[in-house]
């Protein structure tokens, strides 16, 4: 999906109002220094591409993120503010969701969510630069 036509201001507002709180709740009990940020993004569409990938694409050691509240909210936000996102992405993420087993917050998942927080912060910084 090409995130170029999204309403970035509205996505930022949703992130600051609600998604960020759920990400921080998920990370509770860990320190910001516990993980190094290894994933980066260069502009707003690129940041959303990386956020979409890390949130919804299962990895061998962390397959359960798409069921989390922050993931459901991310999906709703992208569906609302990125025209055409639902048609191309929702069915794919729905299929992934069905393939998942039990919900276990592993260290690897915490690391992945730490990366997500970094990507979202980067997304907001690139937004501020443009304004």
């Amino acid at each position: 999906y090409d995130f170029t036509n999204c309403d970035f201001q509205k996505i930022e507002a949703d992130y600051l109002r609600t998604i960020s709180k759920d990400l921080i709740t998920y990370m509770s009990g860990t320190k910001s220094t516990d993980f190094n940020n290894t994933v980066s993004c260069s502009n707003r569409p690129h940041c959303l591409t990386e956020i979409q990938s890390l949130t919804f694409n299962p990895t061998p050691r962390c397959a359960s993120l798409a069921k989390e509240m922050f993931a459901r909210k991310t999906k709703a936000t992208l569906a609302l503010w990125c025209p055409g996102y639902s048609e191309t992405q929702i069915n794919a993420t729905q299929a992934m969701k069905k393939a998942r087993k039990s919900k276990v917050t592993t260290n690897k998942c915490l690391e992945q969510v730490s990366q997500l927080l970094g990507l979202w912060r980067r997304f907001i910084r690139t937004l501020l630069k443009k304004q």
Epitope: D7, K10, D14, R17, T18, I19, R72, K73, K75, A76, T77, A79, L80, W81, P83, G84, S86, E87, I90
Partner: antibody
Amino acid sequence: QVQLVQSGAEVKKPGSSVKVSCKASGFTFGSYGINWVRQAPGQGLEWMGVIVPLVGVTIYAEKFQGRVTITADTSTSTAYMELSSLRSEDTAVYYCARGQEYFYWYFDLWGQGTLVTVSS
Amino acid sequence: QSALTQPPSASGSPGQSVTISCSGSSSDIGGYNRVSWYQQHPGKAPKLMIYDVSKRPSGVPDRFSGSKSGNTASLTVSGLQAEDEADYYCSSYAGTDTFILFGGGTKLTVL
């Protein structure tokens, strides 16, 4: 049973406000969009706005901006539409309608409608 | 005044086909494949008949079909039946600001 049940008919004076409720049952309320659509007597459908409780987003039609407030109480699976500064042309049947989960732009479930009459 | 334009009326005899048009712009119908059609009988709530231009919800007869060309969407009812007599409204997604637009409605009469 999957349904939307709306509050009863209202008669209001010009200049006052009306608050219509829409109680959802049989589905996960928060993930869907709850839209409000009105229909004046003998007229067509007019979209007023939507709320997506999951992310707390509301979008209003430009015509109603500043006069309509849509809210939701996820604990009771109820959405509300409040319209202020009522005038006679606001006399209409007000419907709530469910916008599909993540596909918010089509309405697959409708409430029975609430008749609001504005008259002095 | 509606942002989407529909003919006020259409008619056909039982068994015939009738097509109702819905005209918009590149900002709504032409820009997205997000057109819906609703049927409304007098005194009843509307019912979704077609969504995403041409998809039918379960329970809607396959006599109802939708299509789109450029900025115009169409609803075709084939093999008309008496119970198809109703008002039909088109609707389109219109971007993240306007969100939803409705047509003015078409009264379908089965002769």
